[in-house]
Amino acid sequence: LPAQVAFTPYAPEPGSTCRLREYYDQTAQMCCSKCSPGQHAKVFCTKTSDTVCDSCEDSTYTQLWNWVPECLSCGSRCSSDQVETQACTREQNRICTCRPGWYCALSKQEGCRLCAPLRKCRPGFGVARPGTETSDVVCKPCAPGTFSNTTSSTDICRPHQICNVVAIPGNASMDAVCTSTSPTRSMAPGAVHLPQPVSTRSQHTQPTPEPSTAPSTSFLLPMGPSPPAEGSTGD
């Protein structure tokens, strides 16, 4: 730029560029003013007159310094599974984000295009990885000594309670039930006396697909990773 401050429109010196709030107009071959956020170029500059800017109309915006002939249209209204976290103004687009209990399955530059409900882990399964704004809940089977008796997108597997005397052993979907009486020789029918330290966890059986009165043998099966949908409900 020349020592004297240049006012738009001006011809840049050879090899120099326009200032940050200016653009080079190829037709006029001049540095011309950009329009501010919330405005657009109504009339482009000439050699003798600068850009004429005008405010964006309702439901349109420009977020940056620009020389676009028309403002951009704001996105459509947020859907029922979304909340509007930023309103459409002359300077910014509407931003929709997923409401609580949902996550963004398909994002866009700002906000979310498609929301989906967070997976709920069914009884016998707990949350291995919580849901975030952009990722679903991951469920895992409750490990021996832990359980989850809820259908939830937030509950983790919790340890079984520790019994001196176990009335009903815990499994993956149910806590252990302790006897209220102190250990005696004559034990209540069905009660299992565990001659172990108090800190020992109760017995545990893995969840099975179907309820069964037969003793569970699933603990004999290899415990590999479960398929993605296992342990989750569709609701």
């Epitope: 006012f7 200032r19 940050l20 709030r21 501010s36 956020p37 600068d50 310094w65």
Partner: antibody
Framework: QSVEESGGRLVTPGTPLTLTCTVS????????ISWVRQAPGKGLEWIGI?????NTAYATWAKGRFSISRTSTTVDLKITSPATKDTATYFC???????????????WGQGTLVTVSS | AYDMTQTPATVEVAVGGTVTINCQAS??????LAWYQQKPGQRPKLLIY???DLASGVPSRFSGSGSGTEYTLTITGVECADAATYYC????????????FGGGTEVVVK
Amino acid sequence: QSVEESGGRLVTPGTPLTLTCTVSGFSLSSNAISWVRQAPGKGLEWIGIINTYDNTAYATWAKGRFSISRTSTTVDLKITSPATKDTATYFCARDVHNNVVPYYFDMWGQGTLVTVSS
Amino acid sequence: AYDMTQTPATVEVAVGGTVTINCQASQSISNLLAWYQQKPGQRPKLLIYDTSDLASGVPSRFSGSGSGTEYTLTITGVECADAATYYCQQGYSSSNIDNVFGGGTEVVVK
């Protein structure tokens, strides 16, 4: 080329006061003008701006308390109802652009002192 | 809002030393930042515009840098004449703002 402020004086609270920025050596046809103030011992505080199309913008705290207007050679700042907190030196400054968003100021006046006291 | 926060409020520097003044915007101002110098009883003087471009007649010991929300004014080889208060100013938006200027940094030269 210069800009010069005038009209600063001692006023009582609530008495409207108009300050004037007069330009010389250049035309007001291509530049926005801002008003900036500085309370004693404090920093610079932008009040507002007017461009050649008579479009204006104000700081949030200045809306309703100040009004900027212009002629071909002057820009006025009206303090609608001065309060003691408005005691300051008031500067006018030439913007290098003509938008109501200040770009940068290449020319400043020497300032005019306004004292609001009862 | 595009609030401008300047740090430190005061800085002491020896003659010949280097001083760095920081200016942080509450959101990106796309390098539309200017710096001014003001000495007691005087009008402000433009030093730098567009983050790093020196205004006419400003010594090269003044330099500016930064992007997004973080900007810096650096004075290397400080001279006694550099004792002043320095202000940053954003040139991005005037919508819903309290001040385009930062709070100022007083440079004391020892």
